[in-house]
């Protein structure tokens, strides 16, 4: 599998409509919780919790502060922690407790505490429960949590130093935790947790399961350096621990290795960054998407692998176990266990078969079973990804978070759209297209290029958004910027399953927002722009420049996958310095203007989509160079002369008979043509027009070719 290409389009922060929320002097907006029925987004930040309108997060509805007392800060600082940063209260758990309350935990100056937040009064109840085992002491330590039927399941560290990892269930009637033993958890970095419900009509009377995802130091592979391993672990919701062996401990804790590698190159992604569980009516079993980086990531590699949950369950239900054996110098080695396995199966949830054998609860399980799972929590079998390969591998980027949406294109094809955030504040939107990855777009969510810490996807029909949290605030982005594609070709070439061209309105529309989704709309996920209707009109610009001056002709082709070149009087321009230059890699500079430079200039783009090449006329300029006698008095047109040598620009609309896409012979001018190779970096501000004219109509000429004004964005 090849590396994913660069994003086709890069949207700068200012180019698209993004809604932002941040409060002065509040940082670390890392906990997000969406209440779809209330259209409210709850935001947990440092020392504060906010409720904002989920449809417009800039509208704050409520706020509550949970600050650390000066006394607590001082005690924390005495232990060597920073009073300004670490000895504060970082909200780490923000979970629904009931229809009217949230369960909130914070680091609380290295004395983790939890409380109930009343959503009516938006005040804390002042319970001040001990948050140990539910929330980390250190804001820098990893954590994950999920609320299941009023009980909090957490993965975090249990002590001040962060040296005792724990996966626990906070429950009044049956609290459980992991054994503090290396085979169970070995310096884990917790990533994600979620509950997977069993269908009520499940034939085996199975239990709901809670899955935990983390990276830990390997016990089974030992090299000179510590090898990190991505893990999937699971516990059963009905687990009550053992009566004697594994008392108050999980009897159902099993873990397995997650495989995400590129088989052909030996490239192994072994650091888990984030996980998203995709549930969809069309999916019998949930699919989880996991985001990885390699352990030694000096080149900025990231990968996404997708897994069927049934694959993981198969490993836990029928897979072989690993066992530790002591070899020379009391060195421990982990190998496959091939001996007899006690019954009931160690680590299994209590199902109808177990109940039939009178094992109605884990408290009744025989000590042989419990002792076995205590000593063998690690499975020998690994969980392999769908198709045995990553869905996406990207170079030169560090992905941080992932959410996935399953959507249906106009032709009925179902696409899993991956929204992946980066450590530079961007969001990539990607899909798999016929075993290749297409990164539809990159959106710069945060101006300061700060890492995205949290990503959340709304699942409500209609207005759907991605919410991203960072150190400085939260950004709300729509799932697609369809309206930014100004032409049918642009709309089709975007290959965005959310977008389709509407000929009646001549706009690119979001599918889920249209009344009758398929009527007359054009969407071609193959990128075949020939389906677009013919147009006979195009816009062009007429410029008047003075003799000897310099002209800049603009060309704002948004596609990073397109090659841009210029034609003058239907001949491809050669890079004959000092006559021509490129500004911002797309705009044409013409130096030392003379009458011979007058004429028609066209900016063309060439984009390969599958095995087809799509040509477009992006911009057309008519240039007229005039000899201007030196005026005796100050010129009356000085207001228009904004660029020194430019006298005036006017926009004309005309029929464009005779213009056609360049032939391959003309296009093949690799030696001398001024071309623009695909651009990996986000488009800079150098493409910004000097004179902005917003009234230019978007009109088409022939198929797979259109003319548009240079300042179209």
């Amino acid at each position: 599998m090849a590396f994913a290409p660069i994003p086709r389009i890069t949207w700068e922060h200012r180019e698209v409509h993004l809604v932002q929320f941040h409060e002065p002097d509040i940082y670390n907006y890392s906990a997000l919780l969406l209440s779809e029925d209330k259209d409210t987004l709850y935001i947990g930040a440092r020392e504060a919790v906010f409720a904002v309108n989920a449809l417009n997060i800039s509208e704050k509805q409520h706020e509550v502060y949970w600050k650390v007392s000066e006394d607590k800060k001082a005690k924390c600082a005495e232990k060597g922690k920073s009073k300004q940063t670490e000895c504060l209260n970082y909200i780490r758990v923000l979970q629904p407790l009931s229809a009217t309350s949230l369960y909130v935990c914070g680091t609380n100056a290295f004395q983790p505490a939890c409380d109930h937040l009343n959503l009516t009064s938006f005040k804390f109840l002042g319970k001040n429960e001990d948050g140990k085992g539910r929330c980390p002491f250190d804001p820098a330590h990893s954590y994950t949590s999920v609320m299941v039927d009023g009980e909090l399941y957490s993965g975090t560290s249990y002590n001040f130093l962060g040296s005792e990892p724990i996966i626990s269930r906070n429950s009044s009637h049956s609290p459980l935790r992991t054994e503090y033993a290396i085979p169970w958890l070995n310096e884990p970095s917790f990533v994600f947790a979620d509950v997977i419900r069993k269908s009520p009509d499940s034939p085996d009377g199975e239990d709901d399961r809670v899955y935990f995802f983390f990276t830990e130091v390997s016990v089974e592979y030992e090299f000179v350096f510590r090898v990190l391993i991505p893990r999937i672990a699971r516990v059963c919701k009905g687990d009550q621990g053992g009566l004697r062996t594994l008392q108050k401990k999980w009897t159902s804790f099993l873990k397995a290795r997650l495989i995400c590698s590129r088989p052909d190159s030996g490239l192994v992604f072994n650091v888990l960054r984030d996980v998203f569980v995709l549930r969809s009516p069309g999916l019998k079993v949930p699919v989880f998407y996991a985001l990885f980086t390699p352990q030694l990531n000096n080149v900025g590699l990231s990968a996404v692998c997708a897994y069927n949950l049934s694959t993981a369950e198969e490993v836990f239900s029928h897979g072989k176990y690993m066992q530790s054996t002591t070899v020379e110098q009391s060195h421990t080695k982990w190998v496959r266990y091939n001996g007899p396995v006690p019954k009931p199966r160690p680590g299994a949830c209590i199902d109808s078969e177990a109940r039939a054998a009178n094992y109605t609860s884990s408290l009744n399980l025989p000590d042989k079973t419990l002792q076995f799972v205590k000593d063998h929590p690690l499975m020998d079998d690994s969980v392999t990804p769908i198709d045995n390969r990553p869905r996406l591998i990207k170079k030169d980027v560090n992905y941080t978070q992932i959410v996935v949406d399953r959507t249906q294109a106009l032709d009925g094809t179902v696409y899993d759209v991956m929204f992946v955030s980066t450590d530079r504040g961007a969001l990539h939107k990607a899909i798999s297209l016929e075993h290749a990855v297409h990164i539809i777009e990159e959106t710069q969510l945060f101006q300061d290029f700060e890492p995205v810490q949290t990503l959340l996807l709304s699942s409500k029909k209609g207005n759907r958004f991605v919410y991203a949290g960072s150190n400085s605030g939260v950004v709300q982005a729509p799932l697609a910027f369809c309206g930014k594609h100004g032409t049918c070709e642009d709309c089709v070439l975007a290959r965005d399953p959310y977008c389709a061209w509407s000929p009646p309105t001549a706009t690119c529309v979001a599918l889920h927002q249209t009344e009758s989704p398929s009527r007359g709309l054009i969407q071609e996920m193959s990128g075949d722009a020939s389906v677009c209707p013919d147009k006979s009109k195009g816009s062009y610009r007429q410029h008047f420049f003075k003799h000897g001056g310099t002209a800049e002709l603009k060309c704002s082709q948004k596609s990073n996958l397109a090659r841009v070149f210029w034609k003058f009087q239907n001949g491809v321009l050669k890079a004959e310095s000092p006559k021509y230059g490129l500004m911002g890699r797309k705009n044409l500079l013409i130096f030392n203007l003379s009458e011979g430079d007058s004429g028609v200039y066209q900016c063309l783009s060439e984009e390969r989509v599958k095995n087809k090449t799509v040509f477009q006329v992006v911009a057309k300029h008519v240039l007229e160079v005039k000899v201007v006698p030196k005026p005796v008095v100050a010129p009356t047109l000085s207001v228009v002369q904004t660029e020194g040598s430019r006298i005036a620009t006017k926009v004309l609309v005309a029929s464009t008979q005779g213009s056609s896409p360049p032939t391959p012979a003309v296009q093949a001018t690799s030696s001398g043509a001024i071309t623009l190779p695909p651009k990996p970096a986000p488009t800079g501000t150098s493409c910004e027009p000097k004179i902005v004219i917003n009234t230019v109509p978007q009109l088409h000429s022939e198929k797979t070719m259109y003319l548009k004004s240079s300042d179209n964005r």
Partner: antibody, heavy 122, light 108 residues
């Protein structure tokens, strides 16, 4: 109705082996989760746990007395036998047997015998 | 070996609250059971699994377990509550049950 009755010698000599039998009714030691345990209490002192045997024939012993204790069961007779070797006067105590409820019932020492006083003296 | 320490005695006036503690290392990792023993009788379970009251036991008996200490609370103590009370737990590292040292509750 569950009942347990301890039986054995009231007097044993030092260095001798004590054999105690717990005969029970109202439950079966083949039922999942059930166990029978032995506890003793020297006169005027605290309770001390000795040993346990469960339905799955798992056996546990007090670490301080492990080398001297043996527990066994005869499910057909509804009996549990505890033997204690090398008796000493400090082993003088009331010896109780008790039923341990299944885990899902709470796993506690649910029903106790009335106890049998064993005196170790020469 | 693992030890559970209880105060030797607790005195309480009728109607008042008696609290009996049971201390042991990381006791909240274990289930604590409380037994009541009256003179000349076999022990009877009062509280199991930290805080669950056995059926037939009056509501005035309650239990808790946090950190290194478990507590049996008798609110509105009555004369009939005068007895010896023992805490008990399973010690998993040595696979054995351990009883506390016992507390004599006297109702004044």
């Amino acid at each position: 109705q569950v009942t347990l009755r301890e039986s054995g010698p009231a007097l044993v000599k030092p260095t001798q082996t004590l054999t105690l039998t717990c005969t029970f009714s109202g439950f079966s030691l083949t039922t999942t989760g059930v166990a029978v345990t032995w506890i003793r209490q020297p006169p005027g002192k605290a309770l001390e746990w000795l040993a346990l045997i469960d339905w799955d024939d798992d056996k546990y012993y007090s670490t301080s007395l492990k080398t001297r204790l043996t527990i066994s069961k005869d499910t057909s007779k509804n009996q549990v036998v505890l033997t204690m070797t090398n008796m000493d006067p400090v082993d003088t105590a009331t010896y109780y047997c008790a039923r341990i409820a299944s885990g899902d019932s709470g796993g506690y020492f649910a029903d106790w015998g009335q106890g049998t006083l064993v005196t170790v003296s020469s | 070996s693992y030890e559970l320490t209880q105060p030797p005695s607790v005195s309480v006036s009728p109607g008042q609250t008696a609290s009996i503690t049971c201390s042991g290392d990381k006791l909240d990792d274990k289930y604590v059971y409380w037994y009541q023993q009256k003179p000349g009788q076999s022990p009877v379970l009062v509280i199991y699994m930290d805080n669950k009251r056995k059926s037939g036991i009056p509501e005035r008996f309650s239990g808790s377990n946090s950190g290194n200490t478990a507590t049996l609370t008798i609110s509105g103590t009555q004369a009939m509550d005068e007895a010896d009370y023992y805490c008990q737990a399973w010690e998993s590292s040595s696979d054995q049950y351990v009883f506390g040292t016992g507390t004599k509750v006297t109702v004044l």
